[in-house]
């Protein structure tokens, strides 16, 4: 048994449910929106389309005491080969420019969406 | 919020040229499909151009093809219509606007107008 114990644990979650799962964490979140999301707190907006996942969670991981977008600051880190801490700042980012995080969120869902249906898991 | 500011409309006689600008702010423009749009007095709004997020692919209404050119800048936020061999019947208010099929990511900007005339 406790060889084959490894075999039933599960193994790597395949990219394209990581990413089916993630897109349906942010349509929970767009619809389900009341108040204003994380108090209408303003994040770093980003101006490409290479490393987005890093890019999108050095954003959202500068937004603190925001229990509706934790979940998804969790699933981002999946896709993020290295390791994300507040304060980070990336070229992917647009310095002067902040946007609101219902509508980052709302944009990154209609991007990952778009992959999706390109085929891009990754 | 999300704001589109179109500018660079005027008068223009006819063959000649206008560059469109329009500056984008409040959302993240290089995830949208974005295009121009254009209403000439007394008629219908028509689409005039589209152009992917990446600026890869392009649509051109059959009136411009060959004399119109979109294109964008996604580390400015900018959208752009190069216009040349204007006509009169390009006469129009020019929109900037998103071009997503995806409902509720419809945004507009006021308009910018051009008129061709000699």
């Known amino acids: 048994l406790t060889c084959l114990g490894g075999f039933a644990s599960p193994g790597p979650v395949p990219p394209s449910t990581a990413l089916r799962e993630l897109i349906e964490e942010l349509v929970n979140i767009t619809q389900n929106q009341k108040a204003p999301l994380c108090n209408g707190s303003m994040v770093w907006s980003i101006n490409l389309t290479a490393g987005m996942y890093c890019a999108a969670l050095e954003s959202l991981i500068n937004v603190s005491g925001c229990s509706a977008i934790e979940k998804t600051q969790r699933m981002l880190s999946g896709f993020c080969p290295h390791k994300v801490s507040a304060g980070q700042f990336s070229s992917l980012h647009v310095r002067d420019t902040k946007i609101e995080v219902a509508q980052f969120v709302k944009d990154l869902l209609l991007h990952l969406k778009k992959l999706f249906r390109e085929g891009q898991f990754n | 919020g999300v704001q589109l500011l179109e500018s660079g409309g005027g008068l223009v006689q006819p063959g000649g040229s206008l560059r469109l600008s329009c500056a984008a702010s409040?959302?993240?423009?290089?995830?949208?499909?974005m295009g121009w749009a254009r209403q000439a007095p007394g008629k219908g709004l028509e689409w005039v151009s589209k152009?992917?997020?990446?600026?890869?692919?392009?649509y051109y209404a059959d009136s411009v093809k060959g004399r119109f050119t979109i294109s964008r800048d996604n580390s400015k936020n900018t959208l752009y219509l190069q216009m040349n061999s204007l006509r009169a019947e390009d006469t129009a208010v020019y929109y900037c606007?998103?071009?997503?099929?995806?409902?509720?990511?419809?945004?507009w900007g006021q308009g910018t107008l051009v008129t061709v005339s000699s």
């Open positions: 409040g959302f993240i423009f290089a995830w949208y499909d």
């Open positions: 152009i992917g997020d990446k600026g890869g692919k392009t």
């Open positions: 606007a998103t071009a997503e099929d995806e409902p509720g990511y419809d945004y």
